[in-house]
């Protein structure tokens, strides 16, 4: 779902069932400790040296709900994910960095904790190079995997 | 194989309830979405909403948020579908069909359909 | 919501022949695009998914193409039992739409 340009962003949300309140995980994974901003979230994987994973998606986005769905259920995406700085942005950043090719979802980015954007870790589809679908979840583990191994590591 | 068993037919009143179930086999049943969709007779194809067994997660077409309510029983791997203050216009063929074998939302494959006619 | 439009509404062919089938989505889709075929009577059977992937078990002659809002459903040739009711339906955004269908016919 691309939200500049297709009606995403202007979801009507009462086509949706009626929600609990949720955490800050919003069902990407409830036992995780998720960020609640992106300043937090820089913050905090600068200073814990710990790589940031940053999952934009949107509540009434079907293939946002799927991949949740295939996230929050895959026991290695879940434990991989503890050595992350964790946030899920269901709005869009000033930072441009944080959409190189597009402000669709869902998408996401690796920044590593020097804070440089991990651009160069990709998903299957060249028009949208952050996109995973549900069949990409072996991809999403290598790539969390090559975020991991930190550009410049600390002495 | 994979297996959608829906029940049978349904003649009711005007203003009455129907719950149409959709009994499923063969795969993983709480990792697949569920959707419905009506035919009405010789017409096309209406996407009615989708459930997610796992939790119980839905998403409805706003044609149908008001009457229709979808759920799923993972003890005995069952989606339903109820349908309140039956009119004449929902007498059609109702059809669960399952998302995708890795979670994803295409519809791949198909009950045999249920008639629900709605005449006084 | 997402408005397809499927064309021709009929399509008179011999078996044998090549068909050509084509759905319009009123904005962008991505590939987000199945085909379905369905035989009076009975339940739609899906025939291709993400615009151009072959469902298992589904013969060969069936290919799908095009992304963003063109996509073109191709029978290379058809075979008796392919006469039916042809319909598209988009899965990239709530709700979910079909197309309002195109029906083979023998000629």
């Known amino acids: 779902k691309d939200i500049t340009v297709k009606s995403g962003a202007k979801k009507d949300t009462k086509d949706s069932a009626p929600k609990l309140p949720q955490t800050l995980s919003r069902g990407w994974g409830d036992q995780l400790i998720w960020t609640q901003t992106y300043e937090e979230a820089l913050y905090k994987s600068k200073t814990s040296n710990k790589p940031l994973m940053i999952i934009h998606h949107l509540d009434e986005c079907p293939h946002s709900q799927a991949l949740k769905k295939v996230f929050a259920e895959n026991k290695e995406i879940q434990k991989l994910a503890e050595q992350f700085v964790l946030l899920n942005l269901v709005y869009e950043t000033t930072d441009k960095h944080l959409s190189p090719d597009g402000q669709y979802v869902p998408r996401i980015i690796f920044v590593d904790p020097s804070l440089t954007v991990r651009a160069d870790i990709t998903g299957r589809y060249s028009n949208r190079l952050y996109a995973y679908e549900p069949s990409d979840i072996a991809l999403l583990l290598d790539n969390m995997k090559k975020a991991l191994k930190l550009l410049k590591t600390e002495l | 194989q994979v297996q959608l068993v829906q029940s049978g037919s349904e003649l009711k009143k005007p203003g009455a309830s129907v719950k149409v179930s959709c009994k499923t086999s063969g795969y993983v049943f709480s990792r697949s979405w569920m959707n419905w969709v009506r035919q009405a007779p010789g017409q096309g194809l209406e996407w009615i909403g989708w459930?997610?067994?796992?939790?119980?997660?839905?998403n409805y077409n706003g044609k149908f948020k008001d009457r229709f309510v979808l759920s799923a029983d993972k003890s005995v791997s069952t989606v339903y579908l109820q349908i309140s203050s039956l009119k004449a216009e929902d007498t059609a063929v109702y059809f669960c069909?399952?998302?995708?074998?890795?979670?994803?939302?295409?519809?791949?494959?198909w009950g045999q359909g249920t008639l629900v006619t709605v005449s006084s | 919501e997402i408005v397809l439009t499927q064309s021709p509404a009929t399509l008179s062919l011999s078996p044998g022949e090549r068909a050509t089938l084509s759905c319009k989505a009123s904005q962008d889709i991505n590939s987000y695009l199945s085909w379905f075929q369905q035989k009076p009577g009975q339940a739609p059977r899906t025939l291709i998914y993400?615009?151009?992937r072959l469902v298992d078990g589904i013969p060969a002659r069936f290919s799908g193409s095009g992304s963003g809002q063109d996509f073109t459903l191709t029978i290379s040739s058809l075979e008796p039992e392919d006469f039916a009711v042809y319909y598209c339906?988009?899965?990239?955004?709530?709700?979910?739409?079909f197309g309002g269908g195109t029906k083979v016919e023998i000629k």
């Open positions: 339906l988009q899965y990239d955004e709530f709700p979910f739409t």
């Open positions: 993400r615009a151009n």
């Open positions: 459930i997610y067994p796992g939790d119980g997660d839905t």
């Open positions: 069909a399952r998302g995708g074998y890795d979670g994803s939302p295409w519809l791949s494959y």
